[in-house]
Amino acid sequence: AWELTILHTNDVHSRLEQTSEDSSKCVNASRCMGGVARLFTKVQQIRRAEPNVLLLDAGDQYQGTIWFTVYKGAEVAHFMNALRYDAMALGNHEFDNGVEGLIEPLLKEAKFPILSANIKAKGPLASQISGLYLPYKVLPVGDEVVGIVGYTSKETPFLSNPGTNLVFEDEITALQPEVDKLKTLNVNKIIALGHSGFEMDKLIAQKVRGVDVVVGGHSNTFLYTGNPPSKEVPAGKYPFIVTSDDGRKVPVVQAYAFGKYLGYLKIEFDERGNVISSHGNPILLNSSIPEDPSIKADINKWRIKLDNYSTQELGKTIVYLDGSSQSCRFRECNMGNLICDAMINNNLRHTDEMFWNHVSMCILNGGGIRSPIDERNNGTITWENLAAVLPFGGTFDLVQLKGSTLKKAFEHSVHRYGQSTGEFLQVGGIHVVYDLSRKPGDRVVKLDVLCTKCRVPSYDPLKMDEVYKVILPNFLANGGDGFQMIKDELLRHDSGDQDINVVSTYISKMKVIYPAVEGRIKFSTGSH
């Protein structure tokens, strides 16, 4: 028998520095977690103790903090090289800055293979990107070889900016011939490493003949066997065992997100490459694990540029950006409109001639808007200003919801109106009229939404049975502020870009902004 240790991360999302327990900015260092310096300590400890170790990343290193905003992926290549990752799969967020934003900072600089079998380049890009990412890689590990095949969510064109010269194929269809090819190359131990979410990970384990282990990402799935060490609630045991269609037991793993855990899986193979046993658990990277001093020093060196960046002007406002709780928790506020407009703008993807865009709607809890921005400072808007407005380090995500769920969400928005509670929704691509004289749960008297399947966008009444795409904060997608109906009834959820980054990109693009209060939210009675 031959034993392999798989160390894995996924959805790190730019958390190079240690973070608080909820993966936001580290405040009290003695209680902080994760970060590449701490990760390196643990990885090195395991490499020294065990003979056959692979360090793998299942995608979405890009996007999530000011580190990515400033360094644009160069930080990912640098620190992943320093940690000596063995392979990485492409995630959807690796395309956030377009193909060039992937090629130059990461693909050309990484000293480890970057993989995806279901992304096919065409046209002029084919020769430019040739060899920079691979469908698979055969890695020598001790006296053996291990094949790693990569995959990426085929929804990437709707979630990011891969352009028109990359085709995202069905994962299973693309993986099978690569696995078959590996078998002709004498490779009898094969890991599928990819970024399509836990449901697809399980399908790959079930359907792709010859895959021995699946290491996934995208859905931020936390798996654990035994008592979990922090706040995350396990979605199942680690590893999650899938019985394949040809009768094999295939371990499937994922390691939550944000570099909070290091996935740790031990696999025992027989001489024919069959999995005999698999066990392990994610390792919580808490403060009991010291940060590696040399990596930490490097982080501090790279940090300097971030501090300079946060005070630089992104653009100007010529109007007061009203982000006060007195406005945003009670009525339409122009800060809410600005943020929603930025959220939609960030999701412009012309992937179908029938649609002017795949999504037109935004909702945003007023309680998530934490500060106004005064225009009387020469109109200057900085990252620092935006960090005061959006201090929680969240993301603006894409969900699919039925009209009936949206209606419930808008009822919830005003079910206890007047108490300055955070659930009051700011909107984009939506016209809502409330009648507060009616009883809670029946206050939405008009709800019109902007069409997507149209050449001239116009507002149509919401249809209860229709499925709509909506951009919203991850906080809402996860049921925050009492929006349990969103969490319970959403049909699809894909995590998006860092909230501040979305707004800062929009302001930089527009240069000068002047958002108005324009009648997106109306009240049919009372003095509003």
Epitope: S127, V138, V145, P177, K181, K183, T184
Partner: antibody
């Protein structure tokens, strides 16, 4: 010593069948993908077929698809090529070869070849 | 019929440098590695270069390989009389799901 010893070649009439064998020694046969390659008189090398280490995956050149079948017996350390419906253009020196681990298209060890002549 | 194109012949005096090209497409050399074989008269082919530029043990360092885009090349830097042979490039072709060989190049030592 790593060796591939071939047998089974000869003269055969068009439309008939022939089975080539390739006996392996000196290495763990069951760990290697195996290939057949041929060279017609005065022509270049032409790849014929490959079989994975466990026999589960087989690929063929278009020119032999549906007529030739590659197989292996790991217990006997032997590779086979069953050639049916032979044509004159199948006349060639046939080589068996082992694939290099992890490198597509790289054949590390070759047999000395066996001649197949298809003639009436 | 070969999918990879090589010049039919190449020659040089002893000690000279000879380069053989191998042209393919995105489905073979473009997405896979190039391998080179030497076939001496009356002998079975032997692997000369694998993985674009790697030499198996026992292959002299005067043989070197490289790949760029959808082409590969083999360089014999100090030609010797025993290098007179046929040389073939090869690669896996993803659209054919099989190996493809080059047309072959006959190297003559003058």
């Amino acid at each position: 010593e790593v060796q591939l010893v071939q047998s089974g070649g000869g003269v055969v009439q068009p439309g008939r069948s022939l089975r080539l064998s390739c006996a392996a020694s000196g290495f763990t046969f069951s760990s290697y993908g195996m290939h057949w390659v041929r060279q017609a008189p005065g022509k270049g090398l032409e790849w014929v077929a490959v079989i994975s280490y466990d026999g589960s995956i087989k690929y063929y050149a278009d020119s032999v698809k549906g007529r030739f079948a590659i197989s292996r017996d790991n217990a006997k350390n032997t590779l086979y090529l069953q050639m049916n419906s032979l044509r004159r253009e199948d006349t060639a020196m046939y080589y068996c070869a082992s694939g290099l681990t992890g490198v597509a298209g790289a054949l590390g060890v070759w047999g000395r070849g066996t001649l197949v002549t298809v003639s009436s | 019929q070969s999918v990879l194109t090589q010049p039919p012949s190449a020659s040089g005096a002893p000690g000279q440098r000879v380069t053989i090209s191998c042209s393919g497409s995105s489905s073979n050399i473009g997405s896979n590695t190039v391998n080179w074989y030497q076939r001496l008269p009356g002998a079975a082919p032997q692997l000369l270069i694998y993985n674009n530029d790697q030499r198996p043990s026992g292959i002299p360092d005067r043989f070197s390989g490289s790949k760029s885009g959808t082409s590969g090349s083999l360089v014999i830097s100090g030609l010797q009389s025993e290098d007179e042979a046929d040389y073939y490039c090869a690669a896996w072709d993803d659209s054919l799901s099989g190996n493809v060989f080059g047309t072959g190049t006959k190297v003559t030592v003058l």
